[in-house]
Every structure is written in structure tokens, then in C-alpha cells.
């Protein structure tokens, strides 16, 4: 991953929420659900309405990066997806409001969002070689690739 000192120089400014109340499904069509207060996991659901709904906020980089940088919040909450280290679960961090500016160690709240057809990838800004991923019998975590699943489908709210 990129050196921390390099990342800490970049400032990210909040622009706007670009998606509301969407579901993330992995390549096995398992949906992301709440495992507990702190962690997420993936499971096959008999009703997709039971999946976690996310909002996505866009940030602009002071580096004028071409990548789309986003924050992921659980809809109707103040809980934000936060990266830890490789193979560690992502955490749900409570914050009173969406951060207006993010820099330094707080970049663990941010992800580069890439799309390839219907596949969506979320790379950690703090760990640019690691993706949000699902893993069998484990929490949603950060991983570099297989056997973890790193590509997701976004299911939009039709309401």
C-alpha cells in the first residue's frame, strides 16, 4: 500500500450524497447485513429488504485525482464504514455528521469507487491495494483479492 506520509498530504472535501438507500450484493449474490453493532457480514436473504441500505457521499481530492472518492454510510444512521488493515473487518464508526474535510489517518473512512460493467469495487484510500470484500464465514473486511470476494452489485432503491 502507499506510504502513509504520502496519503496524509492529500485533503478530501465533501461534495454531496450521490446515492441513497442502495444494497450491496457480492458476486455470490449474498447481501451485506449487520452482524452486530460494529461489524457487517454477507448472507443469502429470502427478502432483500432485510439487507443493509447504504448512502454514498462523494469527495473531491486536493490532488485532483481522476478516481471517484466516496464515503459509505448506513442509511438513516450516523454509522460510517471504516477500513482497518488487511483481513481485518471493516468497522462501523459513529460520527455526529458527515465529515466536511478528510485528511491523514481519517482517510480510512474513504474508498475509491470503480465500476466495470455491473461490477463495483471499493478500494481503501488508506490502503490502495485493498478492497472492501466478503469472505465465507467472516465479516466484511479488507482484502487484496481471492478467496475473498471484492466485486459487488449495487441494487438501487426503486421507491
Amino acid at each position: 500500500s502507499a506510504p502513509f506520509s504520502f496519503l496524509s498530504n492529500v485533503k478530501y472535501n465533501f461534495m454531496r450524497i450521490i446515492k441513497y438507500e442502495f444494497i450491496l450484493n457480492d458476486a455470490l449474490n449474498q447481501s451485506i447485513i449487520r452482524a452486530n453493532d460494529q461489524y457487517l457480514t454477507a448472507a443469502a436473504l429470502h427478502n432483500l429488504d432485510e439487507a443493509v441500505k447504504f448512502d454514498m457521499g462523494a469527495y473531491k481530492s486536493s490532488k485532483d485525482d481522476a478516481k471517484i472518492t466516496v464515503i459509505l454510510r448506513i442509511s438513516k444512521t450516523q454509522l460510517y464504514v471504516t477500513a482497518q488493515d488487511e483481513d481485518q473487518p471493516v468497522l462501523l464508526k459513529e460520527m455526529p455528521e458527515i465529515p466536511k474535510t478528510i485528511t491523514g489517518s481519517e482517510t480510512n473512512l474513504l474508498f475509491f469507487w470503480e465500476t466495470h460493467g455491473t461490477k463495483n469495487y471499493f478500494t481503501s484510500v488508506a490502503h490502495p491495494n485493498l478492497f472492501i470484500a466478503t469472505k465465507q464465514d467472516y465479516w466484511v473486511c479488507l482484502a487484496g483479492g481471492p478467496p475473498s470476494i471484492t466485486d459487488f452489485q449495487i441494487l438501487e432503491n426503486q421507491a
Epitope: N29, A44, H46, L48, D49, E156, N157
Partner: nanobody
């Protein structure tokens, strides 16, 4: 007893439209994903679309995206599939199914099917 009864199939010309219906009974309809799947002559089952219990979330196979629309009326316990811009390759028996979003097998119940033939 769970029952799923499809209707609305028939012969239609390429570019035409059809609306399939599926009447459901025997379970709490609004608490389950519902699916449309199809089986073309001599082929295996192909998943077409899914809709969540409330109808708020839908997803489509790439082969039908932009042409087909899944919907449901929970007050009538009925699932629908609006099929537009039909092509010869859409010819199949269409089944509605109840079940998990992805399991092996993914569906715990499905109907007897309705035949859609797209031909000039």
C-alpha cells in the same frame, strides 16, 4: 400450501410486448423475494429478475435489462413481468418462483410456467 400460478404467455411478434402475471397464495407474500426464471427449448433454467418483498429493490439479468420490468402488487399477492422489445431468443417457458436471492438450488417453490413464443 404454497401455490404460484403464472398467466399471460402467448405468441408475439419480434419487437412486441407481453405482460406476465403470477398469482401467489399460501405464504406471506410481502415478506419474500420473488423471481422470474425461464427455460428456453433444450436449455437450462435462466434467472431473469428478482424483486424484494416490498418491491423497493429489483435486479435483472443482463440479457433483459432495459426491456423487462418486474413489479408486484402486495395487496393482490401478484407478481408481474412486463416484457417489451421481445426477441426470438426470449422464447421460453417463464416461471415465477419464491426463494433466496442465491442459494443452490435458489428457489424453494415455483409455478407450472407460462409459454412465451416470439416469432414472426
Amino acid at each position: 400450501e404454497v401455490q404460484l400460478l403464472e398467466s399471460g404467455g402467448g405468441l408475439v411478434q419480434p419487437g412486441g410486448s407481453l405482460r406476465l402475471s403470477c398469482a401467489a397464495s399460501g405464504f406471506t407474500f410481502n415478506q419474500y423475494n420473488m423471481f422470474w426464471v425461464r427455460q428456453a427449448p433444450g436449455k437450462g433454467l435462466e434467472w431473469v429478475s428478482v424483486i424484494s418483498g416490498s418491491g423497493r429493490f429489483t435486479y435483472y439479468a443482463d440479457s433483459v435489462k432495459g426491456r423487462f420490468t418486474i413489479s408486484r402488487d402486495n395487496s393482490k399477492n401478484t407478481l408481474y413481468l412486463q416484457m417489451n422489445s421481445l426477441r426470438a431468443e426470449d422464447t421460453a417457458v417463464y416461471y415465477c418462483a419464491k426463494g433466496w436471492w442465491r442459494r443452490d438450488p435458489p428457489f424453494d417453490y415455483w409455478g407450472q410456467g407460462t409459454l412465451v413464443t416470439v416469432s414472426s
